[in-house]
């Protein structure tokens, strides 16, 4: 269960608008992508989860914000710049790039609600778009026209 | 802006629990994955969006539910059973499988809220996990031990 304080504005406010105010401005992730610290992981496993068996393997990085819902989001971080060869599972194939797939996810931030006289009346939820990287995908490089 | 009625339960109820009731039971997508109707798309493009350039290309199918937030979700549908060759961009390589990457996304459903005497008091939001397919990933097939 959520333990956030009540998100009900005071009587007279437009609850639905106050509760879920729409913003189309994507919020950048809290933590910038760091270069991979585990170059030894740049291989495609023959077992394990999908992100390990992929020829564009990735790991997940936790992004936690207690004032956001969901509080925990995970960002994919590619382990290789190119795709891993399907034949060997370890050597890189420069004909393919390992690229991040991004998605603007709907999230909610809590912020103070204000009553009729500007008094603090619990918390309201503000809806935002938040960019997360979902996975790494093996793609053919763009051909520059 | 949202035009849903107020989602505040009656006085005395635990708003945070009532507003955002947590369920860990994933909600299945409304429509099961269907085999691709457009096999001519089973190729990796050298331009266009990531899902077209991937060697495990996919398309997106819209899943709209007016009683859910977000109302629009997109399910990836793989266009090929195997990965496309990095060399040709069209022939399939049976050494790699194109597999769906799934994610349990947090969504919210609106449902009637009930007051102290069981009366209907607007709508509350119920938090649920909803399984979406995010992308298709080229993976090495599992080796059965």
């Amino acid at each position: 269960y959520s333990h956030w304080p009540s998100c009900c504005p005071s009587k007279g406010q437009d609850t639905s608008e106050e509760l879920l105010r729409w913003s189309t401005v994507p919020v950048p992730p809290l933590e910038p992508a760091r270069p991979n610290r585990h170059p030894e992981s740049c291989r495609a496993s023959e077992d394990g989860p999908l992100n390990s068996r992929a020829i564009s393997p990735w790991r997940y990085e936790l992004d936690r914000d207690l004032n956001r819902l969901p509080q925990d989001l995970y960002h994919a971080r590619c382990l290789c710049p190119h795709c891993v060869s399907l034949q060997t599972g370890s050597h890189m194939d420069p004909r393919g790039n390992s690229e991040l797939l991004y998605h603007n996810q709907t999230v909610f931030y809590r912020r103070p609600c204000h009553g009729e006289k500007g008094t603090h009346k619990g918390y309201c939820l503000e809806r935002r778009l938040y960019r997360v990287s979902l996975a790494c995908v093996c793609v053919r490089p763009r051909v520059m026209g | 802006y949202s035009h849903w009625p107020s989602c505040c339960p009656s006085k005395g109820q635990d708003t945070s629990e009532e507003l955002l009731r947590w369920s860990t039971v994933p909600v299945p997508p409304l429509e099961p994955a269907r085999p691709n109707r457009h096999p001519e798309s089973c190729r990796a493009s050298e331009d266009g969006p990531l899902n077209s350039r991937a060697i495990s290309p996919w398309r997106y199918e819209l899943d709209r539910d007016l009683n859910r937030l977000p109302q629009d979700l997109y399910h990836a549908r793989c266009l090929c059973p195997h990965c496309v060759s990095l060399q040709t961009g069209s022939h399939m390589d049976p050494r790699g499988n194109s597999e769906l990457l799934y994610h349990n996304q947090t969504v919210f459903y609106r449902r009637p809220c009930h007051g102290e005497k069981g009366t209907h008091k607007g709508y509350c939001l119920e938090r649920r996990l909803y399984r979406v397919s995010l992308a298709c990933v080229c993976v090495r097939p599992r080796v059965m031990g």
Partner: antibody
């Protein structure tokens, strides 16, 4: 000013395919889904499907049994409808229509193209 | 698919009359209903969305009401320029479906 301009009339033989284009201007093309609606002579409007230009996401009317393909070229702000295995009952006017929405209550086709007459005979 | 049925299929009324068109859904669609107007030889135009909200530029003589399965489009005082076919459309679920249309003429 929002405008949707469709390609010209087409005459096709049964079994052939047709591709209709819809060029959008006056708004952010990727910000709105595009619907396609058919009107056969003297018949009601029939929804064929929609596409979100932002990610190419589609929803099709299964009554067309997979004969419809919707695509977009975002660089040209153009949506396309392709209908294959044409039959005489596919004769009609084909409209593209932008879908407006708010966060919760409505999805409505607020701007329509001028229509493309497709004749199958 | 959700079936939409309009009545009457056609009607004739005099200028200044109050005109009512009804639309019935085969299952409950809450308020997820739009109305469109199509004048002879022209493109359909959005008239009313979400059962009762008037689209911008639409004269206030048009109004909509209803909920669940039964909906009404009302023209409070018919004008000559209102000659058209009117369609209801549900958007609760895909595929979107339209009524068969109501053809409105002036007596």
């Amino acid at each position: 000013e929002v405008q949707l301009v469709e390609s010209g009339a087409e005459v096709k033989k049964p079994g052939a395919s047709v591709k209709v284009s819809c060029k959008a201007s006056g708004y952010s093309f990727s910000g709105y889904t595009m619907n396609w609606v058919r009107q056969a002579p003297g018949q009601r409007l029939e929804w064929m499907g929609l596409i979100n230009p932002y990610n190419g996401g589609t929803s099709y009317n299964q009554n067309f049994k997979g004969r419809v393909t919707l695509t977009v070229d975002t660089s040209a702000s153009t949506a396309y409808l392709e209908l294959n295995s044409l039959r005489s009952e596919d004769t009609g006017v084909y409209y593209c229509a932008r879908e407006d929405y708010d966060s919760w209550t409505f999805f409505a086709m607020d701007y329509w193209g001028q229509g493309t007459l497709v004749t199958v005979s | 698919d959700i079936q939409m049925t309009q009545s009457p299929s056609s009607l004739s009324a005099s200028v200044g009359d109050r005109v009512t068109i009804t639309c019935s859904a085969s299952q409950g669609i809450s308020n997820y209903l739009n109305w469109y107007q199509q004048k002879p030889g022209k493109v359909p135009k959005l008239l009313i969305y979400y059962t009762s909200s008037l689209h911008s530029g639409v004269p206030s003589r048009f109004s909509g009401s209803g909920s669940g399965t039964d909906f009404t489009l009302t023209i409070s005082s018919l004008q000559p320029e209102d000659v058209a076919t009117y369609y209801c459309q549900q958007y609760l679920a895909f595929p979107y479906t339209f009524g068969q249309g109501t053809k409105l003429e002036i007596k």
